[in-house]
């Protein structure tokens, strides 16, 4: 058999460290900010700034805190009950279908279209056809007019909570 991790090696959530408050589970569940101990008898605090849990749970591990990537700003830090809130930097946005990275906002609308929405941390500029008023799909054609926009002011955070 393998014999590798000693009690000293174990991650803090597996030790009864002084800074980790323990309490008893309520009906088998531990409160937000805690996970259940391996023996099922205690609730152990998540490690501030390292992991978290948002709901009553019987998890053996807390969830890892998100670390904001370069190109993101941290709106609020990770606590034991809430994940880090990261937001794309000015001039970039995060799409729902590719939430793992911030993309640059377009600088202008294609020919024959007008801008009706600014760049925000969660959306590209919005363009509509001058005549019909229908939205542009978001694909950028090869030729663009020099209709430029300044990045919009962030209105709300884009949370990557797990």
């Amino acid at each position: 058999e393998s014999a590798l991790i000693t009690q000293q090696d174990l991650a803090p959530q597996q030790r009864a460290a002084p800074q980790q408050k323990r309490s008893s589970p309520s009906e088998g569940l531990c409160p937000p900010g805690h996970h259940i101990s391996e023996d099922g008898r205690d609730c152990i605090s998540c490690k501030y700034g390292q992991d978290y849990s948002t709901h009553w749970n019987d998890l053996l591990f807390c969830l890892r805190c998100t670390r904001c990537d370069s190109g993101e700003v941290e709106l609020s830090p990770c606590t034991t009950t809430r994940n880090t809130v990261c937001q794309c930097e000015e001039g970039t946005f995060r799409e729902e279908d590719s939430p793992e990275m911030c993309r640059k906002c377009r600088t202008g609308c294609p020919r024959g279209m007008v801008k009706v929405g600014d760049c925000t941390p969660w959306s590209d500029i919005e363009c509509v056809h001058k005549e019909s008023g229908t939205k542009h799909s978001g694909e950028v054609p090869a030729v663009e007019e020099t209709v430029t926009s300044s990045p919009g002011t962030p209105a709300s955070p884009c949370s990557l909570s797990g």
């Epitope: 393998s2 590798l4 088998g28 101990s37 099922g40 019987d58 053996l60 591990f61 793992e100 797990g162």
Partner: antibody
């Protein structure tokens, strides 16, 4: 020194039953979750089931839910896996593993399901 | 969720090799990753836990990392030695189920 010794493997017909045991020593058995992990011949590792240190919580992979039952006897420092309605695809080496981190593994016991 | 690893990698002694482990649906971004080494005919042993921590007895040549943007974990082995030839498995945890990658066979040429 942590030691985990599995037993109870063998040849069984499809639809049959088998009970695996794991004798543990070298650590405070009741303080740790325990798992069974299996490995089919020439294949990768597959987690099967886990149980909390007190035995109050049990967890199962979808592939064995309703057929396998994990249990433990803390007074005997022994982990069990009761396997019913066995199928050919359950053929594997079954490892007894200590802790939520799966940090110590036994040598395994072979279970063969064949007619 | 699933964890996907390359089937095999190979490198010469003394060199550095990296084995990737890509998760589905943000799983690796949220949950800690462990790595196990399994030499032929032996039980697995843990070489990295909680993303990048090394148990005692595991050489400093082994290191782990996480890349949230690609939802992947990596195991890097530097100064490759012939005894590093083995199967390597990543593993993570998703609400009280333990999930393994398919394994990567490392060949030291």
């Amino acid at each position: 020194e942590v030691q985990l010794l599995e037993s109870g493997g063998g040849l069984v017909q499809p639809g049959g039953s088998l009970r695996l045991s794991c004798a543990a020593s070298g650590f405070t058995f009741s303080s740790y979750a325990m798992s069974w992990v299996r490995q089919a011949p020439g294949k990768g590792l597959e987690w099967v089931s886990a149980i909390s240190g007190s035995g109050g919580s049990t967890y199962y992979a979808d592939s064995v839910k309703g057929r396998f039952t994990i249990s433990r006897d803390n007074s005997k420092n022994t982990l069990y896996l009761q396997m019913n309605s066995l199928r050919a695809e359950d053929t594997a080496v079954y490892y007894c593993v200590k802790g939520a981190w799966l940090d110590y593994w036994g040598r395994g016991t072979m279970v063969t399901v064949s007619s | 969720f699933m964890l996907t690893q390359p089937h095999s990698v190979s490198e010469s002694p003394g060199k550095t090799v990296t084995i990737s482990c890509t998760g589905s649906s943000g799983s690796v971004a949220r949950n800690y990753v462990q790595w196990y080494q399994q030499r032929p005919g032996s039980a697995p042993t843990i070489v990295i836990y909680e993303d990048n921590r090394r148990p005692s007895g595991v050489p400093g040549r082994f290191s782990g990392s996480i890349d949230r943007s690609s939802n992947s974990a990596s195991l890097t082995i530097s100064g490759l030695q012939t005894e590093d030839e083995a199967d390597y498995y990543c593993q993570s945890y998703n609400y009280n189920t333990w999930v393994f990658g398919g394994g990567t066979k490392l060949t030291v040429l």
